[in-house]
Interface confidence: low
């Protein structure tokens, strides 16, 4: 909190420019005018304010709005985006595209912070519903954000969003996602040549059906364990002991150590014993 | 199906400490996000703290920083939340809710939690 305290003759400030970085905070506090600040914000970030210049800056803006502050200054927030909290926060009406691409330009790069959530919900909240503009403006910054909405909300998910997610970032997508995210991946990649479709299609294979595995088991895609654990308990259930063993190409010795989990072991019991005798791994059906 | 059931809540002075337990059964696959949030009277449901399972990466609202610390145990799907130093302005409902969450920040904000416990109550005197 910084002391109330007259301005010093001759420095009011008429408008927000570079001389006030050589002002003290409380100079900041006395001579400059929280209405101006407000109309001048996009000045703000081509003046190399120090953080504890933003704090009394910030604090000028929370005294004038103390209610929330209206989107006319929270579009042009910049870097001072990065000095609310999510309770400064939550009292924003945000329901411009615009200012919410400002703002996540702003943290880009970092992973998403407690504001950056709230931000997206107050956005969320403020449209009423997930658009596809919106979902592909989150999907870009934040390509991961898909695995937090529901399977209701991916529906509204362009394929053009699917090029931008990384393996990591399915990590967190239950199986009722995938079986959103699979098909939209699937026409996203339809284009690719078969090795670079199946490093691309790969993470989302959670959602695929069996048809679409046993046309894989085809191509000699050598599937890791881990891609194959993930896989449809109903999808793998109808693959034949010829077709997993083409799936998973030199892999195939992996069922072994998973015999007792979930695909691998609702499998082995469909199998007839000769069929799984020919992998020569000891599996019991 | 998810059922979360929390223990642990009460009554105790300004300063004294309560640990809150929360069990989780049914299907986690994909819940990746466990934590609290409260609910004062007259006032909306706050995120408290968050972790992801797993990997033990946190989330705590600033209110609580220092305070509180978020623990699990993965074996037996429970989520803990140790509360030191209590103050007045803590006294609320409690809830423990499972979301989706790509990373652990993403716990603040109550739009995508999918499951919640019926709630415990801490009571903070001063």
């Known amino acids: 909190e910084v002391e109330k305290t007259a301005c010093p003759s001759g420095k009011k400030a008429r408008e927000i420019d570079e001389s006030l970085i050589f002002y003290k905070k409380w100079e900041l506090e006395a001579c400059v005018d929280a209405a101006l600040l407000a109309t001048q914000m996009d000045r703000v970030n081509a003046i190399p304010f120090t953080y504890e210049q933003l704090d009394v800056l910030k604090h000028k803006l929370d005294e004038l709005y103390p209610q929330g502050y209206p989107e006319s200054v929270i579009q042009h927030l910049g870097y001072l985006f990065l000095k609310m909290s999510p309770e400064d926060i939550r009292k924003w009406n945000v329901t411009s595209l615009e200012t919410l691409k400002a703002l996540l330009e702003v943290n880009k790069g970092h992973e998403m912070s407690p504001q950056v959530a709230t931000l997206i919900d107050r956005f969320v909240k403020g449209r009423g519903q997930l658009d596809k503009d919106t979902l592909d403006t989150l999907t870009a910054f934040y390509p991961g954000y898909l695995c937090s909405l529901s399977p209701e909300e991916l529906s509204s998910v362009p394929p053009s969003s699917i090029w931008a997610v990384r393996p990591q970032d399915l990590d967190t997508c239950d199986p009722r996602q995938l079986d959103v995210l699979y098909p939209k991946a699937r026409l996203a990649f339809q284009n690719m040549n078969g090795s670079e479709y199946f490093v691309k299609i790969q993470s989302f294979l959670g959602g695929a059906p069996t048809e679409d595995l046993k046309a894989l088991s085809q191509q000699n895609v050598s599937m890791d364990l881990a891609t194959f654990m993930k896989l449809r308990t109903d999808a793998v259930l109808p693959l034949t002991v010829a077709e997993v063993q083409k799936l998973l190409g030199p892999h195939v010795e992996g069922l072994k150590a998973e015999e007792r989990h979930r695909p691998v072991r609702d499998w082995i019991l469909r199998q007839r014993q000769d069929d799984l005798d020919t992998l020569g791994l000891g599996l019991q059906g | 199906q998810v059922h979360l059931v929390e223990s642990g809540g009460g009554s105790v002075q300004a300063g004294g400490s309560l640990r809150l337990s929360c069990a989780a059964s049914?299907?986690?696959?994909?819940?990746?996000?466990m934590g609290w949030f409260r609910q004062a009277p007259g006032k909306e449901r706050e995120a408290v703290a968050g972790?992801?399972?797993?990997?033990?990466?946190?989330y705590y609202a600033d209110s609580v920083k220092d305070r509180f610390t978020i623990s699990q145990d993965n074996a037996k799907n429970t989520v803990f939340l140790q509360m030191n130093s209590l103050k007045p302005e803590d006294t609320a409902m409690y809830y423990c809710?499972?979301?989706?969450?790509?990373?652990?920040?993403?716990?603040?904000?109550?739009?995508?939690?999918?499951?919640w416990g019926q709630g415990t109550q801490v009571t903070v005197s001063s």
């Open positions: 809710a499972s979301k989706y969450c790509a990373v652990v920040a993403e716990f603040g904000g109550p739009r995508l939690v999918r499951y």
């Open positions: 049914g299907d986690m696959n994909g819940y990746k996000c």
């Open positions: 972790i992801y399972t797993g990997r033990n990466t946190t």
